[in-house]
């Protein structure tokens, strides 16, 4: 009956962790004698190819300084301990502790048997490192030039993480990769870039990080922060201001980052009706008179700059009873 070596084609281990490379001689054959079990790295330099051996009488030896006896052990193989005990070498599973990048590669498990000869199996050990992810908004001020408004960083992954962005904005990503502080790892940084405007402020974009060590992609929401001057509009005009009306109000509506620091109401004519009283963002009109036939201007300032809006007012002689007119400016 032929014997064969059962190994896994590929084994993945975490950097710094412990991994087992399974190796079994199958099936159990009566009278089959295993004279030596060896683990080798066929692709390593000649003096580092022989990694571990298990002798039926003398037990394990670890002939290569890399990985070395401190980091290697046979999981179940047992040597003969005297007259009555047979060596148990059918399971030659090898454990590697404190995995390093240099441990990655092909490993051959070989059984020297009598009378069947040598049989072997090969396993590819992949060393992976789970990256640590973070994403953050960059505080930016509006401009005409594309600017990085968010960063997504996947630190010390092996292989490098894949970063993408989910957003409805008009953007592009710029990626850089640098070696991590842990040898063999890579830190990936993706810069979410757009022309910063008020439209982007407060918008949440999502950084998506994919890595084979993750069961599912990591999704990290980032709320953008764009400093921009006030964007102003005026509401409250209903196209039905008539002489003597007393319940009229104009509101200066603002979107800005940071918050407005001041509101200023004026008219384009330069004359300001005395019955109009500015109260911050509101202009309260006590009684409409003919001086209101003008254009009101609301000017808003914040730390970045200023914005303004105009509202043309038409004063009627009598109320318009035909129906409510359009509001806003």
């Amino acid at each position: 009956q032929d014997v064969r070596v059962q190994v896994l084609p590929e084994v993945r281990g975490q950097l710094g962790g412990t991994v087992e490379l399974p190796c079994h001689l199958l099936p159990p054959v009566p009278g089959l004698y295993i004279s030596l079990v060896t683990w080798q790295r066929p692709d390593a330099p000649a003096n580092h190819q022989n990694v571990a051996a298990f002798h039926p009488k003398m037990g394990p030896s670890f002939p290569s300084p890399k990985p070395g006896s401190e980091r290697l052990s046979f999981v179940s193989a047992k040597q003969s301990t005297g007259q009555d005990t047979e060596a148990e070498l059918q399971d030659a599973t090898l454990a590697l502790h404190g995995l390093t990048v240099e441990d990655e590669g092909n490993y051959t498990c070989e059984f020297a048997t009598f009378p069947k000869g040598s049989v072997r199996g090969m396993t590819w050990l992949r060393v992976i490192a789970k990256p640590k992810n973070q994403a953050e908004a960059q505080k930016v001020t509006f401009s005409q030039d594309p600017t990085t408004v968010a960063l997504c960083i996947s630190k010390e992954g092996r292989p490098p993480a894949r970063i993408s962005w989910l957003s409805s904005l008009d953007w592009e990503a710029k990626e850089t990769q640098v070696s991590g502080t842990l040898a063999g790892t890579v830190t990936v940084t993706s810069r979410f870039t757009l022309v910063p405007s008020g439209r982007a402020d407060g918008v949440t974009v999502t950084c998506k990080v994919e890595h084979e060590s993750f069961e599912e992609p990591a999704l990290i929401p980032v709320t953008l922060s764009v400093r921009y001057p006030p964007e102003v509009s005026i509401s409250g005009y209903d196209d039905n201001w008539y002489l003597g009306r007393t319940d009229a109000t104009l509101s200066c509506d603002v979107r800005s980052n940071p918050e407005p620091t001041g509101y200023d109401w004026s008219t384009t004519s330069g004359t300001f009706p005395t019955s109009a009283v500015a109260q911050g963002s509101q202009l309260v009109i006590h009684a409409v008179d003919s001086l209101f036939n003008t254009t009101f201007v609301c000017t808003v300032t914040n730390a970045v700059g200023m914005g303004r809006a105009e509202q043309v007012i038409f004063v009627r002689e009598t109320p318009n009873t035909a129906g409510a007119g359009a509001t806003g400016g």
Partner: antibody, heavy 115, light 111 residues
Framework: QEQLKESGGRLVTPGTPLTLTCTAS????????MSWVRQAPGKGLEWIGV??????STYYASWAKGRFTISKTSTTVDLKITSPTTEDTATYFC??????????WGPGTLVTVSS | SFVLTQPASVQVNLGQMVSLTCTAD??????ASWYQQKPGQAPVLLIY???SRPSGVPDRFSGSTSGNTATLTISGAQAGDEADYYC?????????????FGGGTQLTVTG
């Protein structure tokens, strides 16, 4: 540079115990099975015994049992000749076992047993 | 006990191929190794695990086994190959263990 060097060989009178020491450099002795081999003048190689990498097992040639003791520390392997006879006159080599072969040898140390 | 038999001496002409044999008195369950030893020097491992060659050993040295016999072949012998050659194997039979050397073959390169 991986090296082995034997020491302690000298002229002794029959029956006087003698300990030879093999010192390793450039590698860790605890990772390897280590053997002692001797060669009488003009004769062939003769295996004396082995100590396992862990130090937990020692095996001797049938003719050497009781006449020799092998022990090890983290950097040395010792061979004690308990009661030398004139037939023990030889060059004594320590050797490192790797995958079924002795791939590193010391230059040898000469032991002469004479009255 | 386990015995390995080698011819005491073999001659070969310079540049010729030569095969050195090593016969076990009982069928070995283990690998054969071959060593070269020059006068006044320590042995050097040439072949281990029947056919494997350590790094640094010229590829004109090769090993093979068939039944009870292990063979070291030197293809294109050189003057520097003149030396004693020892075969060896480990005897794992029973509860004990020993490593056994053959008696050695003295190789002379002529011409």
């Amino acid at each position: 540079q991986e090296q082995l060097k034997e020491s302690g060989g000298r002229l002794v009178t029959p029956g006087t115990p003698l300990t030879l020491t093999c010192t390793a450099s450039g590698f860790t002795i605890s990772s390897y099975h280590m053997s002692w081999v001797r060669q009488a003048p003009g004769k062939g190689l003769e295996w004396i015994g082995v100590i396992s990498a862990s130090g937990g097992s020692t095996y001797y040639a049938s003719w050497a049992k009781g006449r020799f003791t092998i022990s090890k520390t983290s950097t040395t392997v010792d061979l004690k000749i308990t009661s030398p006879t004139t037939e023990d006159t030889a060059t004594y080599f320590c050797a490192r076992e790797s995958y079924g072969g002795y791939n590193l040898w010391g230059p040898g140390t000469l032991v002469t047993v004479s009255s | 006990s386990f015995v390995l038999t080698q011819p005491a001496s073999v001659q070969v002409n310079l540049g010729q191929m030569v095969s050195l044999t090593c016969t076990a008195d009982t069928l070995s369950r283990s690998y054969a190794s071959w060593y070269q030893q020059k006068p006044g020097q320590a042995p050097v491992l040439l072949i281990y695990r029947d056919t494997s060659r350590p790094s640094g050993v010229p590829d004109r040295f090769s090993g093979s086994t068939s039944g009870n016999t292990a063979t070291l072949t030197i293809s294109g012998a050189q003057a520097g190959d003149e030396a004693d050659y020892y075969c060896a194997t480990d005897d794992n039979s029973g509860s004990s263990y020993q490593y056994v050397f053959g008696g050695g073959t003295q190789l002379t390169v002529t011409g």
